[in-house]
Interface confidence: low
């Protein structure tokens, strides 16, 4: 089942990335280098989707920058296929599933003076299920409330205060949000959750609720990158990968992240009896992408050089802000109860060979199905 996931894995976008750009991991590294001691959390698939949507209305070099920045090689597939691929993906992700909450969406808030092209609005709605809203940015408090209320409603109150402030000179604000909460295939026993130390650095300790469960997990030790990787399946298709770098090796692991590395991990997984200790946490990341994407070559769209003629007839519009917020909650809930003792006995030999894996220092996490839904670093649960 894990092998199947490898074959189906699309990293960041549904079109094969060209070798020039590893969008997901380049974006991760850009966020990590901007704030080395901060936690990071974002949704590559969600950001790729909103950029692809934006490319619908972009022309000439602006469009080229977006698609190249995403690492998309459109000689291999047409633009139409790209958008259709995202349409299909969005439909799959938004399907209601037992024990699986996912709210993902895009919206465009445009100044009252901006007339949007009907073709763009209709393509946006059809392909990306995205909404557009005329907004009075002169009343920045009112505009901010309108945007935050919309996202809070779409995520059933899980994402509030998407925007903390707003420039009254804004013309187009693009909002991209994703919230995820799923049940593990096998739950962690609540009784096994205890307060334990988490080393934010080797000098800064915080107490965290640490979940624990002994079970068979997909596991590997990557000697090249000096880290241990464990896969914990959710109900349905998704799997969480938790990566624990050896002490002092976080940067080495971050530098080694790539589509190739992820595929290798998923291929090399072996079932192993583990006593897994994992913090219970909720993590969120909120990013002003207009500040980060230029370092990945996507800059025109945020400047006066933007060609967004497909969005509006106004010759001088640009995207003022592109805001992305991703939220995930990790707790004990599973669709199947864990054994009451928190231990599943197989053979005596397996029990004796059980290895203890304690996530008590900064670690990385992926949530993958056929795409990388989320990628993050937990520096402080």
């Amino acid at each position: 089942e894990m092998k199947k996931r490898v074959e189906d894995l699309h990293v960041g976008a549904t079109v094969a990335p060209s070798s020039r750009r590893d969008f997901t991991f380049d974006l991760y590294r850009a966020l990590a280098s901007a704030a080395p001691s901060q936690s990071i959390f974002f949704s590559p698939v969600s950001i790729s989707m909103s950029l692809a949507m934006l490319s619908l209305g972009a022309g000439s070099s602006t469009k080229m920058q977006i698609l190249e920045g995403l690492g998309l090689n459109l000689q291999k597939s047409s633009e139409k296929e790209l958008h259709r691929g995202f349409q299909q993906l969005l439909q799959e992700l938004n399907q209601p599933r037992d024990g699986f909450q996912l709210s993902l969406g895009n919206a465009l808030f445009t100044d009252l003076v901006v007339d949007l092209q009907d073709t763009f609005v209709s393509a946006m709605k059809t392909l990306y299920l995205a909404d557009t809203f005329p907004t009075n940015f002169r009343d920045s408090a009112g505009a901010m409330k309108q945007i935050n209320d919309y996202v809070a409603k779409q995520t059933k109150g899980k994402i509030v205060d998407l925007l903390k402030n707003l420039d009254s000179n804004a013309v187009v604000i693009m909002v991209n949000y994703i919230f995820f909460k799923a049940k593990w295939e096998t739950s962690f026993n609540h009784k096994g959750t205890q307060e334990q130390d988490f080393y934010v650095t080797s000098e800064t300790v915080v107490r965290v609720p640490m979940m624990s469960r002994e079970d068979q997990y997909h596991y590997l030790l990557d000697r090249n990158l000096s880290c241990r990787v464990v896969g914990v399946p959710y109900q349905g298709n998704a799997t969480a990968l938790f990566i624990l770098p050896s002490e002092g090796k976080m940067q080495q692991v971050e530098n080694g992240l790539s589509e190739k590395t992820l595929r290798k991990w998923l291929k090399m997984f072996k079932k192993r009896q583990l006593e897994l200790y994992l913090p219970k946490f909720s993590i969120e990341g909120s990013y002003q992408l207009e500040k980060v994407l230029p370092s990945l070559g996507i800059s025109n769209v945020f400047t006066s050089h933007a060609d967004l003629s497909g969005i509006s007839n106004h010759s001088n519009i640009q995207v003022s802000e592109m805001v992305h917020k991703a939220v995930v909650e990790v707790d004990e809930s599973g669709t199947r109860a864990a054994a009451a003792t928190g231990t599943i006995f197989t053979f005596r030999s397996a029990r004796l060979n059980s290895q203890r894996l304690v996530f008590n220092r900064p670690f990385l996490m992926f949530i993958v199905d056929n795409n990388i839904l989320f990628l993050g670093k937990v520096n402080r649960p």
Epitope: S37, D197, Y199, T201, S202, E203, V205, G248, M250, Q251
Partner: antibody, heavy 119, light 106 residues
Framework: EVQLQQSGAELVRPGALVKLSCKAS????????IHWVKQRPEQGLEWIGR????????IYDPKFQGKDNITADTSSNTAYLQLSSLTSEDTAVYYC????????????WGQGTLVTVSA | QIVLTQSPAIMSASPGEKVTITCSAS?????MHWFQQKPGTSPKLWIY???NLASGVPARFSGSGSGTSYSLTISRMEAEDAATYYC?????????FGSGTKLEIK
Amino acid sequence: EVQLQQSGAELVRPGALVKLSCKASGFNIKDYYIHWVKQRPEQGLEWIGRIDLEKGNIIYDPKFQGKDNITADTSSNTAYLQLSSLTSEDTAVYYCARGGYDVPSFAYWGQGTLVTVSA
Amino acid sequence: QIVLTQSPAIMSASPGEKVTITCSASSSVSYMHWFQQKPGTSPKLWIYSTSNLASGVPARFSGSGSGTSYSLTISRMEAEDAATYYCQQRSSYPFTFGSGTKLEIK
């Protein structure tokens, strides 16, 4: 290569003030903690305190608070320890060490500076 | 503040002998770290986070313990192991060191 280069030995009069330096190379001090540790002749190690430039905070062992002053200058990538109102009790070797993210703390130490307080 | 008490203060061991140095904390700590120091040199990180050997430390060294009781063990003493060993806690400020154990070769 990570290195901490400390200033040379000091011979000072009681009551005087001395400022020791610890110049870092191979890393940016803003991204790490810099600790100072005291070792009196034939005695053990005593932690004085540490500076965290990223968050702009300094923590001292209460017994050194007010007496010792830790500062740093990011432009020269150097941390400083200033000792005031010196007495014979301050005669010691003072070490700086790197702490903080990623590589285990205290894995890198300066070579130490001997301060001798004598009339 | 947390007081660390090391014992013995001084000891000597023959080559090949097993050596154990203990460090007792006045209140519970999460991890213990150990340093080796030889005369006229800076201390060296020897064992970190209770049981991890620092880079270049021979495998005959090991560390263990939890709560208030920790130890450093040398499975077979060698001449180059003669030095002073200090334990250190970083679970709460101010960080503190033990008073040291001077290990000599017989």
